[in-house]
Interface confidence: medium
């Protein structure tokens, strides 16, 4: 009797493992072994599957075979018993594309009111992944134990803190990656449950700012104690989005180690332009606090946030007011790369009423003056930006008289 | 003031290598990634991945794995493009350009570009 | 992936007009376009980002608008300088560009 050929053959990648699955066709024959060969593109000899030959099963494991994950490849399946089946033919593919991403690793650290999560590809030195590691990102899913009302968190990095728990309280969560270059998304890791701490005697520092003065920033932040030292750490964002766990270190400021105010003042020059991640701790020489949230600290908007240089034309019945871009130390304007809004005050000298004038435009007209009559202006720079809400301080007052009569044009 | 200048035009053969400079200036190299484009003659861009200048880490779109290679030379604030075992459908123009100012863990749109470089292949 | 659709191959225009170039991306992206304007043998130039935010020294005749899948740029006005060849662009999830609208002048 001839054999007949296996059917529907499917190929499941996970990471690394690379798993065929195929029907018998014949159900009624026993004793019949399958084999497979692959063959590359460009070949024309098929070559014999290490892992897949002489299989009893309908399932063999070739995950051990070293291939171009991104070279297609095209694979052929027999039967054999005394004699064999002719080959069946499986479509081409290629290993990435086809590959789905597996369960990352998840490890949970408790405080009292927060969990840090460190999340790591499912396999370790991935083949498949080698040029994607570091593009993971990962959404999960954390509940209380006691309740199981789910709350997603989208697009995390493979560090990720959640705050605002409760304390002594045991949270759920499961993890799943997606390599959003590739549009793939995985499966979720198991479930890991942790309970979080007794609360600290000592709360982290909350609202944290940063302004500038003269050369300096200066770090202000709320603490509920007195008689406290404080420390600061900074990050460099960027590492945020492609976290290399060799650079991930925290770093002290110099001018915030062991401050005993609720506030630190450093030179501008500590920070390259760029961002950064900037976080607290309290100490009371006994217990230290939690870290606080982090905030995000940008140089480039710190900079230029200074309050608009301005220029005023004077006619008889209006103020044509020019805005430049601030200047830093040296002169020189700062690099202006978020949209700004301009917020415009002007008052009569001899009046408190103010008007205000709200534009997009560095040329502004301010209309309905009296003429030679002297009128004050002082401006402000908000962020135009749904991510970034900063705004300037006023820039000093400046008094211009308008014109005399018919001088409009 | 902010400019990318990219090498000059390449001639090559299938199967050699070309690597494409991209070299940056007036800013802070290392605050910024670094992406990288093509466009083929006739046709619209396409993303072929990005090089955090911070850490060195490359990453790569779906069709540029393989042949293709990111890397940085941070002291000259310079980034490159490497195409090994050239084809004939690589011959495009490539363009490096700059992010705007980005937010950690998102996208920013590209606010300078590199001049191009066009790399044409033939036997 | 995202896939940005500029279905308008061709735009013929006269100056002094008013033209609309459209794009619309396959799923959600927020407001996180950017529009380009490539000149022939010339690298991209950014007109517009976050949609509707004109990059620093475009003229204002350059304006952009939409969110979530469908989005404008508007070109008031139209310059003999603005023979172009325009690109949406979406930074919602890696990059992916439109194919590109060409603006002849009549």
């Known amino acids: 009797k001839n054999l007949k050929s296996p059917q529907k053959v499917e190929v499941d990648i996970i990471d690394d493992n690379f798993i065929l699955r195929w029907n018998r066709s014949d159900e009624s024959v026993g004793n019949v072994t399958f084999s497979f060969d692959y063959q590359k593109t460009g070949m024309d000899n098929w070559i014999k599957l290490s892992g897949c030959q002489n299989i009893t099963s309908t399932k063999c494991n070739f995950s051990s075979l070293k291939l171009n994950v991104y070279e297609e490849i095209k694979l052929r399946i027999r039967a054999e018993k005394e004699n064999t089946s002719s080959w069946y033919e499986v479509d081409s593919f290629t290993p990435f594309r086809k590959a789905q991403i597996g369960p990352p690793e998840v490890h949970l650290e408790a405080e009292d009111k927060a969990i840090v999560i460190h999340i790591s590809p499912g396999t370790k030195d991935s083949v498949m992944w080698a040029l994607d590691g570091l593009s993971f990102t990962y959404s999960l899913v954390i509940w209380k134990n006691s309740s199981g009302v789910e709350e997603r968190i989208e697009n995390i990095y493979s560090r990720h803190k959640i705050y605002k728990l409760s304390p002594e309280t045991t949270y759920c969560l499961k993890v799943k990656a997606a390599l959003l270059t590739s549009w793939k998304i995985g499966v979720y890791s198991p479930v890991h449950c942790i309970k979080t701490t007794v609360e600290n005697e000592l709360p982290p520092p909350e609202n944290i700012e940063v302004s500038v003065q003269n050369q300096n920033y200066v770090l202000k932040w709320d603490y509920t104690y007195a008689n406290m030292t404080f420390q600061v750490q900074w990050l460099h964002a960027f590492l945020k989005r492609n976290p290399g766990n060799h650079l991930y270190k925290w770093k002290q400021i110099p001018d915030c180690e062991n401050v005993k105010t609720t506030q630190c003042v450093f030179p501008q020059n500590v920070f390259q332009k760029g961002i950064y991640l900037l976080r607290v701790q309290a100490s009371d020489g006994n217990n230290t606090s939690f870290w606080s949230e982090e905030i995000k600290f940008d140089t480039e908007i710190q900079a230029f946030l200074l309050p608009p240089v301005f220029n005023i034309r004077s006619l008889s019945d209006s103020f044509h007011i020019y805005i430049g871009a601030p200047k830093q130390s040296g002169n020189t304007p700062v690099i202006q790369d978020y949209p700004l809004i301009y917020e415009i005050i002007f008052w009569e000298n001899t009046s408190n009423a103010e008007r205000k004038i709200i534009e997009k435009k560095t040329d502004v007209t301010v209309p309905n003056l009296k003429p030679l009559t002297v009128y004050c202006v002082k401006a402000r720079a908000h962020t135009m930006d749904e991510k970034l809400n900063k705004s300037s301080v006023f820039s000093d007052a400046v008094c211009e008289k308008t014109k005399p009569g018919n001088t409009s044009k | 003031q902010i400019q990318l200048v990219q090498s000059g035009p390449e001639l090559k053969k299938p199967g050699e290598t070309v690597k494409i400079s991209c070299k940056a200036s007036g800013y802070t190299f290392t605050n910024y990634g670094v992406n990288w484009m093509k466009q083929a003659p006739g046709k619209g861009l396409k993303w072929m991945g990005w090089?955090?200048?911070?850490?060195?880490?490359?990453t790569y779109a779906d069709d540029f794995k393989g042949r293709f290679a990111f890397s940085l030379e941070t002291s000259a604030s310079t980034a490159y493009l490497q195409i090994n075992n050239l084809k004939n459908e690589d011959t495009a123009t490539y363009f490096c350009?700059?992010?705007?100012?980005?937010?950690?863990?998102?996208?920013?749109?590209?606010?300078?570009w590199g001049q191009g470089t066009l790399v044409t292949v033939s036997a | 992936d995202i896939v940005m659709t500029q279905s308008q191959k061709f735009i013929s225009t006269s100056v002094g007009d008013r033209v609309s170039v459209t794009c619309k991306a396959s799923q959600n992206v927020g407001t996180n376009v950017a529009w380009y304007q490539q000149k022939p043998g010339q690298s991209p130039k950014t007109l517009i980002y976050?949609?509707?935010y004109r990059y620093n020294g475009v003229p204002d005749r350059f304006t952009g608008s939409g969110s979530g899948t469908d989005f404008t740029l508007t070109i008031s006005n139209v310059q003999s300088e603005d023979l172009a060849e325009y690109f949406c662009q979406q930074y919602n999830s890696y990059y992916t560009f439109g194919g590109g609208t060409k603006l002849e002048i009549k």
């Open positions: 090089i955090n200048t911070y850490t060195g880490e490359p």
């Open positions: 976050s949609t509707s």
């Open positions: 350009a700059r992010e705007g100012v980005y937010y950690y863990g998102d996208w920013a749109w590209l606010a300078y």
